[in-house]
């Protein structure tokens, strides 16, 4: 009689198999030990209860063991990201066992059927792990499940069903549809492994979110806010990749999670850092660049184990391609206005000058509006390491370069038609580097001239390390 599998009864009954394979008695899930860096190599298929392939293929019982779990597939073939990830794991962890979980027959179906098959696939992985645990020297602590999209939830089921606790699960943009808001036992969740880290790259608050929006791990990282990934816009993909449709833009953004993880493996010397924040808007304002009390972490493979009482949402900006690392800066600008200027929306740009390099001209994104006679916080980021910052050029864009700016200026004029001399005063800019956590204060180069108006610029030079000035009380740093 069939064995009852797990807490919810007989899993085999749940298999949603295509008609073509309903009569097959072969297992629907295969485990391929990738024994070579050569992506074309057929590898070694492991078979539950058969120890010979483990020996023949050189399975290392004491080494780390990675299980790569693919997601839903429209084509029924392994996608190109797979061998990139396999190769990166082999490069980084030379002695590790890299196992590809092949559940293509069960994933190459209607999405709803593939979702319904995740539980049985998770159980197959759990049974393989239970069998491996019977071997001397094999430890679940050394097991790292890496699941992409639907595969992330498969990893969750595997972690849930296995006897004991796996060391780590990494969810690479876990699938959203049919999992968003689901009970913790029906999706990836923090209790599925000792450490669950998640990268979210395709979340949408409008329309269909291919990736899950809710946090599902111990740490949940949302690169670029978890939605629009640089290099994945329609213009980018038409030119640079075999992508030419909205579908391919979606694929580019969804798959970005895999590439960020690969980047963390192969560009160990260029780690990307994420910062804890309550939401994306606060991060965009530059409020959340603190590393105090585990508020920042490396992303991907290099993430430090953090087991918080509650989910930790973390954010970062990235480049459009590998290496993805950028350098984050918080800029605090105290804006004085000596005239009643009404509502004003300046378009500010900064250029940062450092000991290693100078930045490009960077826009200061105004998330809400500029507060007058108050400190405004901004986030800027550079693709290159500037070294120690020396000076800053602040520019207020003059003649409108877009319809949006023209509209802003017209609206500003309509609200204050008799105030043609729009002017703000800025004496100091405080800068904090996210990567180094170093704080610097920059003072207006000419203390007599701190005013800025459209089409004009101001220069600021470093005037001290840290943020406190003479005769100044300690500023209250907003923490996430």
């Amino acid at each position: 009689s069939p064995t009852p599998f797990g807490p919810e009864g007989q899993l085999e009954d749940e298999l949603h198999k295509p008609k073509a394979i309903q009569t097959e008695v072969k297992p629907s899930v295969r485990f391929n030990l990738r024994t070579s860096k050569d992506p074309e190599h057929e590898g070694c298929y492991l078979s539950l209860g058969h120890s010979q392939p483990l020996e023949d293929c050189g399975f290392n019982m004491t080494a780390k063991t990675f299980f790569i779990i693919h997601g839903w597939t429209m084509s029924g073939i392994f996608e190109n990201w797979l061998h990139k990830l396999v190769s990166a794991l082999h490069t980084r962890e030379k002695d590790a066992n890299v196992v590809v979980v092949d559940w293509l027959p069960l994933a190459h179906q209607l999405y709803t059927d593939a979702v319904n098959n995740t539980r049985v696939v998770g159980h197959s992985i759990a049974r393989m792990l239970d069998w491996l645990q019977e071997k001397d020297d094999f430890s679940l602590e050394n097991v790292h499940l890496i699941g992409y999209s639907l595969g992330a939830h498969v990893a969750g089921y595997a972690g849930n069903f296995v006897k004991g606790t796996v060391g780590r699960i990494t969810g690479l943009d876990p699938a959203g549809p049919m999992f968003e808001g689901a009970d913790i036992h029906k999706r990836l969740s923090p209790d599925d492994a000792d450490f669950v880290d998640v990268l979210h790259t395709y979340t949408r608050s409008f329309g269909l979110s291919i990736g899950i929006q809710m946090p599902v791990g111990h740490i949940d990282i949302y690169p670029n806010g978890g939605d629009f990934q640089p290099g994945c816009g329609l213009n980018d993909v038409l030119g640079s990749m075999a992508y030419g449709t909205i579908t391919e833009v979606v694929k580019c953004e969804h798959e970005r999670a895999v590439h960020l993880f690969v980047d963390s493996l192969v560009n160990q010397d260029k780690p990307s850092f994420a910062f804890q924040c309550t939401d994306s808007n606060r991060f965009k304002k530059g409020i959340c660049l603190s590393c105090r009390k585990n508020r920042c972490n490396s992303i991907g493979y290099n993430a430090k184990k953090m087991r918080n009482k509650r989910n930790s949402k973390m954010y970062l900006k990235t480049r459009a391609g590998m290496p993805f690392r950028v350098y984050h800066y918080q800029m605090k600008i105290h804006v004085f206005s000596y005239k009643n200027m009404g509502e004003i929306e300046p378009t500010f740009y900064v250029t940062l000058y450092g000991t290693n390099a100078d930045s490009q001209t960077l826009p200061l994104e105004i998330v809400e509006r500029i507060e007058q006679n108050a400190t405004n916080t901004f986030l800027v980021y550079t693709e290159e390491d500037l070294g120690d910052l020396l000076k800053i050029q602040l520019t207020w864009e003059g003649a409108s370069q877009s319809w949006y700016n023209l509209w802003k200026e017209l609206r500003s004029y309509l609200s204050q038609p008799h105030n043609p001399g729009r002017e703000l005063n800025i004496r100091r800019i405080r800068v904090k580097s996210g990567e180094t956590q170093r704080k610097l204060t920059f003072c207006a180069e000419d203390p007599e001239n701190t005013s800025i108006s459209p089409g004009r610029e101001l220069w600021f030079r470093k005037c001290r390390d840290g943020w406190r000035m003479k005769n100044e009380t300690s500023p209250t740093v907003e923490l996430p």
Partner: antibody, heavy 120, light 112 residues
Framework: QIQLVQSGPELKKPGETVKISCKAS????????MNWVKQAPGKGLKWMGW????????TYTDDFKGRFAFSLETSASTAFLQINNLKNEDTATYFC?????????????WGQGTTLTVSS | DIVLTQSPASLAVSLGQRATISCKAS??????????MHWYQQKPGQPPKLLIY???NLESGIPARFSGSGSGTDFTLNIHPVEEEDAATYYC??????????FGGGTKLEIK
């Protein structure tokens, strides 16, 4: 050594059915996918689709959906191409070719080809 | 679908000279630094034979006079020096991610 050996030439009438075989040897049959490629007389190569030799799930390109069927006899390491309701335009040489499930999916070994002539 | 356009459709090259065949894709066939473009040789009455995979990698057993280059949408197969036995039709093929995978129209090489 690795070999793909196909069945011999076929002469058929329109409306009939043909089944072409491709027997693999020298490697583990279920560890590689099997493609089918059509080449009409004096023309180029046209990919018809492939079959997962482990699960038996076939995938057809748009031009070969309907009358065409890929199947397997795993125990004999053999893949089959069946064409129903034959038409004159099915006259061609059909090749099987294997590819690795992993990596870059190029076709590294090919069968010698089976010539199908459809004529009334 | 990605369309591959080969040129020229045919060419005649003297023994010992260089033959250059071009293959242009309607969109990029690159993926994260790899090009999913392959080249095959087919002689009359024979099946195609893999020469070059992933744009520039020589398949084992293929003479070094065959070489491939290119990335993105533009690829080239070079044969130098051309030998008598190289008379054949050459096809490019792309296998970038989701099928359908496609072949170019072919280039017939004649030896003068």
């Amino acid at each position: 050594q690795i070999q793909l050996v196909q069945s011999g030439p076929e002469l058929k009438k329109p409306g009939e059915t043909v089944k072409i075989s491709c027997k693999a040897s020298g490697y583990t049959f279920t560890n590689y996918g099997m493609n089918w490629v059509k080449q009409a007389p004096g023309k180029g190569l046209k990919w018809m689709g492939w079959i997962n030799t482990y699960s038996g799930v076939p995938t057809y390109t748009d031009d070969f959906k309907g009358r065409f069927a890929f199947s397997l006899e795993t125990s004999a390491s053999t893949a089959f191409l069946q064409i129903n309701n034959l038409k004159n335009e099915d006259t061609a040489t059909y090749f099987c070719a294997r590819f690795s499930y992993y990596g870059r999916h190029y076709f590294d070994y090919w069968g010698q080809g089976t010539t199908l002539t459809v004529s009334s | 679908d990605i369309v591959l356009t080969q040129s020229p459709a045919s060419l005649a090259v003297s023994l010992g000279q260089r033959a250059t065949i071009s293959c242009k894709a309607s969109q990029s066939v690159d993926y994260d630094g790899d090009s999913y473009m392959h080249w095959y040789q087919q002689k009359p009455g024979q099946p195609p034979k893999l020469l070059i995979y992933a744009a520039s990698n020589l398949e084992s057993g293929i003479p070094a006079r065959f070489s491939g280059s290119g990335s993105g949408t533009d690829f080239t197969l070079n044969i130098h020096p051309v030998e008598e036995e190289d008379a054949a039709t050459y096809y490019c093929q792309q296998t970038n991610d989701d099928p359908p995978w496609t072949f170019g129209g072919g280039t017939k090489l004649e030896i003068k």
